[in-house]
């Protein structure tokens, strides 16, 4: 005879256990039904009546078949450094995991209790163990023949470029600078290229910054030697550089004199307005292989007649160290221009948000038929000291930081050559001195 199916509640056979989804109630001494996930026991069973279940209230849950008198409370809302990967429902608890760039320093049964920012390796150190959801980055010094010039939680040390003739040997935090007798790129007259310390990590491609209306522009800014961008194969020899530099300086002086004369004549100018916008990029997006259209600053030897644009740009450089500039010992910069005190020998201390620097440089090149014009070239910067995400940086607030007395029209730069192609070209990365090169 087939055994009869017992309906709850029922008394179990001596020595046997209750069936699946049933529990033994000690008071009633009967096998009773459990409540399904999302429910709890409102009334416990008796010898004659089964368990009465009720749905969990808001912000409470039960994940398993149960006979608990009250549902469990969902965990507190996810903190700002976390992402809610599973919402609180009647059947499951909220799960918080660390957002990108952070790792779980203290885990709980499900999700994470405490997130911490991934360590950033400072220049001279590279990632030797990438961070994971549950482990921090490990930084190690760059081996001989390799370098890292970034403060990053993803960049590994990279080999120095190979030079035919080395101008400046590379070290752990700087690539080698090459020199050669014949230039491998066409140069604008009156200026010498020194490649800039732009990170050229192969494994990261830089997103295209917001398009700019600027044609390829050659600013003349004084700066010291620095490591090259990838693909830079050679520069002018020193004597040629000096000659060209002196020539440029002469032209600059003539231009300034012209300016003084022109300011006397009050004629309305026809101005070509050129804007070079340097968008703020998230820290780990602001690096990558430099495309052919990306621009490098042209340089002249520093002189007493350097314009206010030069000095303000230099001041900006000093004010806002970037990931591509080697930092002073104990201080590390992250991509958004933040500086942190270093707590370790081989890596940076974790830190939050820092100062974001948005630089907008506007140069008005003025021209009128009789060469007499009066206008001011303006370079303005938008700077925000925020703890918010990059997207919340103050875009619209424009704080002028310098005004040119007059922008002269050089023979080297006619309106036609300035306008060049009207197509919009991406500018590089938020690095004040990453510069421009002729396209």
């Amino acid at each position: 005879l087939p055994a009869q199916v017992a309906f709850t509640p029922y008394a179990p056979e001596p020595g046997s256990t209750c069936r699946l989804r049933e529990y033994y109630d000690q008071t009633a001494q009967m096998c009773c039904s459990k409540c399904s996930p999302g429910q709890h026991a409102k009334v416990f069973c008796t010898k004659t009546s089964d368990t009465v279940c009720d749905s969990c209230e808001d912000s409470t849950y039960t994940q398993l078949w149960n006979w608990v008198p009250e549902c469990l409370s969902c965990g507190s809302r996810c903190s700002s450094d976390q992402v809610e990967t599973q919402a609180c429902t009647r059947e499951q608890n909220r799960i918080c995991t660390c957002r990108p760039g952070w790792y779980c320093a203290l885990s709980k049964q499900e999700g994470c209790r405490l997130c911490a920012p991934l360590r950033k390796c400072r220049p001279g150190f590279g990632v030797a163990r990438p961070g994971t959801e549950t482990s921090d980055v490990v930084c190690k010094p760059c081996a001989p023949g390799t370098f890292s010039n970034t403060t990053s939680s993803t960049d590994i040390c990279r080999p120095h470029q190979i030079c035919n003739v080395v101008a400046i040997p590379g070290n752990a935090s700087m690539d080698a600078v090459c020199t050669s007798t014949s230039p491998t790129r066409s140069m604008a007259p009156g200026a010498v290229h020194l490649p800039q310390p732009v990170s050229t990590r192969s494994q990261h491609t830089q997103p295209t910054p917001e398009p700019s209306t600027a044609p390829s522009t050659s600013f003349l800014l004084p700066m010291g030697p620095s490591p090259p961008a990838e693909g830079s194969t050679g520069d002018f020899a020193l004597p040629v550089g000096l000659i060209v530099g002196v020539t440029a300086l002469g032209l600059l002086i003539i231009g300034v004199v012209n300016c003084v004369i022109m300011t006397q004549v009050k004629k309305k100018p026809l101005c070509l307005q050129r804007e070079a916008k340097v968008p703020h990029l998230p820290a780990d997006k602001a690096r990558g292989t430099q495309g052919p259209e990306q621009q490098h600053l042209l340089i002249t030897a520093p002189s007493s007649s350097s314009s206010s644009l030069e000095s303000s740009a230099s001041a900006l450089d000093r004010r806002a160290p970037t990931r591509n500039q080697p930092q002073a010992p104990g201080v590390e910069a992250s991509g958004a221009g933040e500086a942190r005190a270093s707590t370790g020998s081989s890596d940076s201390s974790p830190g939050g948000h820092g100062t974001q620097v948005n630089v907008t440089c506007i140069v008005n090149v003025c021209s009128s038929s009789d060469h007499s014009s009066q206008c001011s070239s303006q370079a303005s910067s938008t700077m925000g000291d925020t703890d918010s995400s990059p997207s919340e940086s103050p875009k619209d607030e424009q704080v002028p930081f310098s005004k040119e007395e007059c922008a002269f029209r050089s023979q080297l730069e006619t309106p036609e050559t300035l306008l060049g192609s009207t197509e919009e070209k991406p500018l590089p990365l938020g690095v004040p001195d990453a510069g421009m090169k002729p396209s």
Epitope: G126, V127, A128, R129, P130, T132, S135, V138, K140, P141, C142, A143, P144, G145, T146, T154, I156, C157, R158, P159, R201, S202, Q203, H204
Partner: antibody, heavy 118, light 110 residues
Framework: EVQLVQSGAEVKKPGATVKISCKVS????????IHWVQQAPGKGLEWMGR????????EYAPNFQDRVTITADTSTDTAYMELSSLRSEDTAVYYC???????????WGQGTTVTVSS | EAVVTQSPATLSLSPGERATLSCRSS?????????ANWVQQKPGQAFRGLIG???DRAPGIPARFSGSGSGTDTTLTISSLQPEDFAVYYC?????????FGGGTKLEIK
């Protein structure tokens, strides 16, 4: 000059444990991870694991996880690889190395032959 | 567990020819997080790391060696084979917390 010098060949019985040493010189041991790689006769390379001598933290390949222990002694500039529960398929040459796809610090020991035979 | 497959197992070419060695990840696309590497082994000689970070030549490695990656594959190219390039080449991919080597490609003289 950077050198990694490994201990000599070993012959072991199945079920036994072998411990190979790797003495480094010419650089600061804590600056780079030390890896252990297995190469069975006529076979390719099998990454076993690595140790960070700075803090002793290790990472192991899933296939070796249960049987391998990699350590480093900074006082003697020596790394060790211990493989337990040996079986015949563990017969191989074992290399210690500072090779790392992250650092380009590329030095290898001369290899230690371990023969597992009953 | 991740499996890294190299192809071909053997490649027979003559000096001066171009060699293309492929390495495929079983777990989907090879990303920058796999930090793809290539290692050379010559009989009776120490191993030598050639490429790191998918396409960076290690210090001292000739320019004829280059690495690239797209989709599930990472590739080692030797533009013009020299007699000393005939060896076994291994690729290695990083998976979260461990390296996995491919089975190797033997590059032999035709």
């Amino acid at each position: 000059e950077v050198q990694l010098v490994q201990s000599g060949a070993e012959v072991k019985k199945p079920g036994a444990t072998v411990k190979i040493s790797c003495k480094v010189s010419g650089y600061t041991i804590t600056d780079f991870y030390i890896h252990w790689v297995q190469q069975a006769p006529g076979k390719g390379l099998e990454w076993m694991g690595r140790v960070d001598p700075e803090d002793g933290n290790t990472e192991y390949a899933p296939n070796f996880q249960d049987r391998v222990t990699i350590t480093a002694d900074t006082s003697t500039d020596t790394a060790y690889m211990e493989l337990s529960s040996l079986r015949s398929e563990d017969t191989a040459v074992y290399y210690c190395s500072t090779w790392d796809g992250f650092s380009y610090f590329d030095y290898w020991g001369q290899g230690t032959t371990v023969t597992v035979s009953s | 567990e991740a499996v890294v497959t190299q192809s071909p197992a053997t490649l027979s070419l003559s000096p001066g020819e171009r060699a293309t060695l492929s390495c495929r990840s079983s777990t989907g696309p090879v990303t920058t997080n796999n930090y793809a590497n290539w290692v050379q082994q010559k009989p009776g000689q120490a191993f030598r790391g050639l490429i790191g970070g998918t396409n960076d030549r290690a210090p001292g490695i000739p320019a004829r060696f280059s690495g690239s990656g797209s989709g599930t594959d990472t590739t080692l190219t030797i533009s013009s084979l020299q007699p000393e390039d005939f060896a076994v080449y291994y690729c290695a991919l990083w998976y979260r917390n461990h390296w996995v080597f491919g089975g190797g490609t033997k590059l032999e003289i035709k």
